[in-house]
Amino acid sequence: KLTIESTPFNVAEGKEVLLLVHNLPQHLFGYSWYKGERVDGNRQIIGYVIGTQQATPGPAYSGREIIYPNASLLIQNIIQNDTGFYTLHVIKSDLVNEEATGQFRVYPELPKPSISSNNSKPVEDKDAVAFTCEPETQDATYLWWVNNQSLPVSPRLQLSNGNRTLTLFNVTRNDSASYKCETQNPVSARRSDSVILNVLYGPDTPTISPSDTYYRPGANLSLSCYAASNPPAQYSWLINGTFQQSTQELFIPNITVNNSGSYTCHANNSVTGCNRTTVKTIIVTELSPVVAKPQIKASKTTVTGDKDSVNLTCSTNDTGISIRWFFKNQSLPSSERMKLSQGNITLSINPVKREDAGTYWCEVFNPISKNQSDPIMLNVNYNALPQENLINVDEQLYFQGGSGLNDIFEAQKIEWHEARAHHHHHH
């Protein structure tokens, strides 16, 4: 059967298309091409007589068509109007006619798009921005790219106008990015240049650094203030409520106790019209900036449970310090049997119980610094326990609480030779 194949089917304006004829019959007199789905003399493009090899243009001939001896038709410099159907009319030597129709679609070669914006300086959490991909092109698909990636899913992003317009509601600083649009049709794809969205924001609450509060007399006080802001914030400093200077850094050499007080950093963004402040307390004191490592002294380190008491003393040569105690990573005192005295220097446990066995340490600190002692181990022994409270694990004797104590006493080895000998005597 006579058929027409369009190569290609989707043709770009300005390019060419070949209407390729398949299964052309033998013994032909000639053939004619027509624009449309039927033979119509008024729409004849070109006729060809095989015997004379003569091509004759018809009313629909534009000078862009070339007919080949195999009846295929080449159309050059395609225009939008060329879209549609084409009919080949074959006249055989026996004057019997045969027809076939083919078609193709014409699309414009897309121009490079550009992005227009309705707001070049949007303010964070306040403004919306609408980007539009120009120009509007029929039969084109519009795509958007943010930092060269496809659009993220967000309730603040909305596509409209056939995806030609991208709207960002309540812009945030995170929307500051590179935006591109792309136009696509079956014959071409073009991407715009980047448009950088510049979201105005801030200032955020300023941060004053360094974070130190305490300084020694004679030191230099150097404070820096920073607040995230676009455009960058303007800074000013106040000390105890009195304006000092309009700079991001504040420097006071050789400070004295008189420089103690509240230091305020004020950050202002003149474009967004917003301002924020942060207040920092500075204390100038003679207190030692380095606290020495304390030591623990114990009245005894091995005691008998429910009988003995013990005193632990945290020794330090520093003055103006505070002391706190720790046992098994918890601060003390943790029971009524524990008492702190002499400004927390001494920890007394009276009487000592089996649960008091373990590691103790103290920490000395002042507002500027702190230091910890090495730990000390307190061992707690018990006399004459009943046989059923002993268990043998790898030939080591451990105490197992009875009458109300459900858990094995935490890996606290009992130095109890008499009970051990008694245990082995019975096994």
Epitope: G14, E16, L18, I46, Y48, A55, T56, P57, Y61, S62, G63, R64, I66, I67, Y68, L74, Q76, N77, I79
Partner: nanobody, 119 residues
Framework: EVQLVESGGGLVQPGGSLRLSCAAS????????IGWVRRAPGKEEELVAD????????RYADSVKGRFTISADTSKNTAYLQMNSLRAEDTAVYYC????????????WGQGTTVTVSS
Amino acid sequence: EVQLVESGGGLVQPGGSLRLSCAASGFNIKDTCIGWVRRAPGKEEELVADICPYKGSTRYADSVKGRFTISADTSKNTAYLQMNSLRAEDTAVYYCAIVSARDGYYNYWGQGTTVTVSS
């Protein structure tokens, strides 16, 4: 009605020059490709040169490269062939034709103009 009318042929001595013109009607030459085809007795038909105004492209047969120049004036809907350094083997009837930019195939031409190169 589509028409191609050639002019400018004549007798010229070897080494001489001629300029052929092809006036087109019934279509715009800016939309298509126009070529010059020559036929000489006992020789194969030859596509000498063509021009596609819409593409801004030109092509030449090896035998005329550097000697012939094809051009088009779309405002006059006319194509030209400037022939320099003519040789005896350039003697032929020159036809203006509508040609394919793809493969140089042509299938509609004018009545032709005769160029004779002889001393």
